[in-house]
């Protein structure tokens, strides 16, 4: 018979022969032959392979180094890598999450549009007219100016993006 030029799923071509790939969590020890099956071995502790493969070495689990602000989100297994995230108040500096930085605070005049997560930083937005923020915060949104009218008061001092309006009593008309 003609030697194959392509193999089925979960197989690979070697020496004009289709061999079975090793399943996730196992590495290749020896290719199959005309007489023997592919030989695979389980990955060692703290190692993994996450696909059907012909790798001769397993990959090492990622280390979520607490000194870099990292913690484990999902423990590694023989078939999956460890997933790291950041400690509370910190977020990853990259998609691979190899280190963490402190969440950014929004300065006065800016409010939090989106609170930071373990993988994304705080998103700030300028306070629009009618709103203010007088603190630097990683949580506070822009607050609406106080409505003097609803309190039967009048505006004594206009608000800004950093300060609330100041309300005062209405001037009594003298008789």
């Amino acid at each position: 018979p003609e030697p194959p030029t392509a193999c089925r799923e979960k197989q690979y071509l070697i020496n004009s022969q289709c061999c079975s790939l090793c399943q996730p969590g196992q590495k290749l020890v020896s290719d199959c032959t005309e007489f023997t099956e592919t030989e695979c071995l389980p990955c060692g502790e703290s190692e993994f392979l996450d696909t059907w493969n012909r790798e001769t070495h397993c990959h090492q689990h990622k280390y979520c180094d607490p000194n870099l602000g990292l913690r484990v989100q999902q423990k590694g297994t023989s078939e999956t890598d460890t997933i790291c995230t950041c400690e509370e108040g910190w977020h990853c500096t990259s998609e691979a999450c190899e280190s963490c930085v402190l969440h950014r605070s929004c300065s006065p005049g800016f409010g939090v549009k989106q609170i930071a997560t373990g993988v994304s930083d705080t998103i700030c937005e300028p306070c629009p007219v009618g709103f203010f923020s007088n603190v630097s915060s990683a949580f506070e949104k822009c607050h609406p100016w106080t409505s003097c009218e609803t309190k039967d008061l009048v505006v004594q001092q206009a608000g800004t993006n950093k300060t609330d309006v100041v309300c005062g009593p209405q001037d009594r008309l003298r008789a």
């Epitope: 996730p24 969590g25 389980p42 990955c43 060692g44 502790e45 703290s46 190692e47 996450d50 090492q60 689990h61 280390y63 979520c64 913690r71 484990v72 989100q73 999902q74 423990k75 590694g76 297994t77 023989s78 078939e79 999956t80 890598d81």
Partner: antibody, heavy 119, light 113 residues
Framework: EVQLVESGGGLVKPGGSLRLSCAAS????????MHWVRQAPGKGLEWVAY????????YYADTVKGRFTISRDNAKNSLYLQMNSLRAEDTALYYC????????????WAQGTLVTVSS | DIVMTQSPDSLAVSLGERATMSCKSS????????????LTWHQQKPGQPPKLLIY???TRESGVPDRFSGSGSGTDFTLTISSLQAEDVAVYYC?????????FGGGTKVEIK
């Protein structure tokens, strides 16, 4: 037959130090991750620390971070727990336990060694 | 940290009867990569260290009798002893094996009625 035998427990004053050892036999020690787990008298189980087979990965419970140090010597088939700045709340039976690279669970536990912190 | 909550605290069952205990986790224990739930059950008999009973929610450890079975997924898990034997008197702990810190439930004490 898998065997894990601890030693080093005892009575120590608050603020004192103690070093626990766990001697392994009946399996290839360097192929396994290892844990320390403790159990206060009459209470449940509390995980303390983990060290990977090759010493590369170490994790601690927040309650012991900065005070306890887990280590291993694969040549001596031994696991250690150095405990400093001991507190009354560290009083417990300390178990070493093995973690394999397949189940990723603690599949064998030692008998435990008692640590008592009291003045 | 993942909080593991077991119920009931204790359970008295007649010999040969079924014993069922529950374990709830404060977040999912499902590994997104291999679709296994990393929930482990340990048995601790009086005066003995814990012993691995079940891993990956429902896989019995070698040598564990088939009267022990585990089920559940995500955050809700159950351990069942189909026909209680005298040697099953113990405290049963569920454990989060999904992430660090590893956390245990408070345990369910199984006694003979």
């Amino acid at each position: 037959e898998v065997q894990l035998v601890e030693s080093g427990g005892g009575l120590v004053k608050p603020g004192g130090s103690l070093r626990l050892s766990c001697a392994a036999s009946g399996f290839t020690f360097s192929d396994y991750g290892m844990h320390w787990v403790r159990q206060a008298p009459g209470k449940g189980l509390e995980w303390v620390a983990y060290i990977s087979s090759g010493n590369r990965i170490i994790y601690y419970a927040d309650t012991v971070k900065g005070r306890f140090t887990i280590s291993r010597d694969n040549a001596k088939n031994s696991l250690y727990l150095q405990m400093n700045s001991l507190r009354a709340e560290d009083t417990a039976l300390y178990y070493c336990a093995r973690q394999d690279g397949y189940r990723y669970a603690m599949d064998y536990w030692a008998q435990g060694t008692l640590v008592t912190v009291s003045s | 940290d993942i909080v593991m909550t077991q119920s009931p605290d204790s359970l008295a069952v007649s010999l040969g009867e079924r014993a069922t205990m529950s374990c709830k986790s404060s977040q999912s224990l499902l590994n997104s990569g291999n679709q296994k739930n990393y929930l482990t059950w340990h048995q601790q008999k009086p005066g003995q260290p814990p012993k691995l009973l079940i891993y990956w929610t429902s896989t019995r450890e070698s040598g564990v009798p088939d009267r022990f079975s585990g089920s559940g997924s995500g955050t809700d898990f159950t351990l069942t002893i189909s026909s209680l034997q005298a040697e099953d008197v113990a405290v049963y702990y569920c454990q989060n094996d999904y992430t660090y810190p590893l956390t245990f439930g408070g345990g369910t004490k199984v006694e003979i009625k």
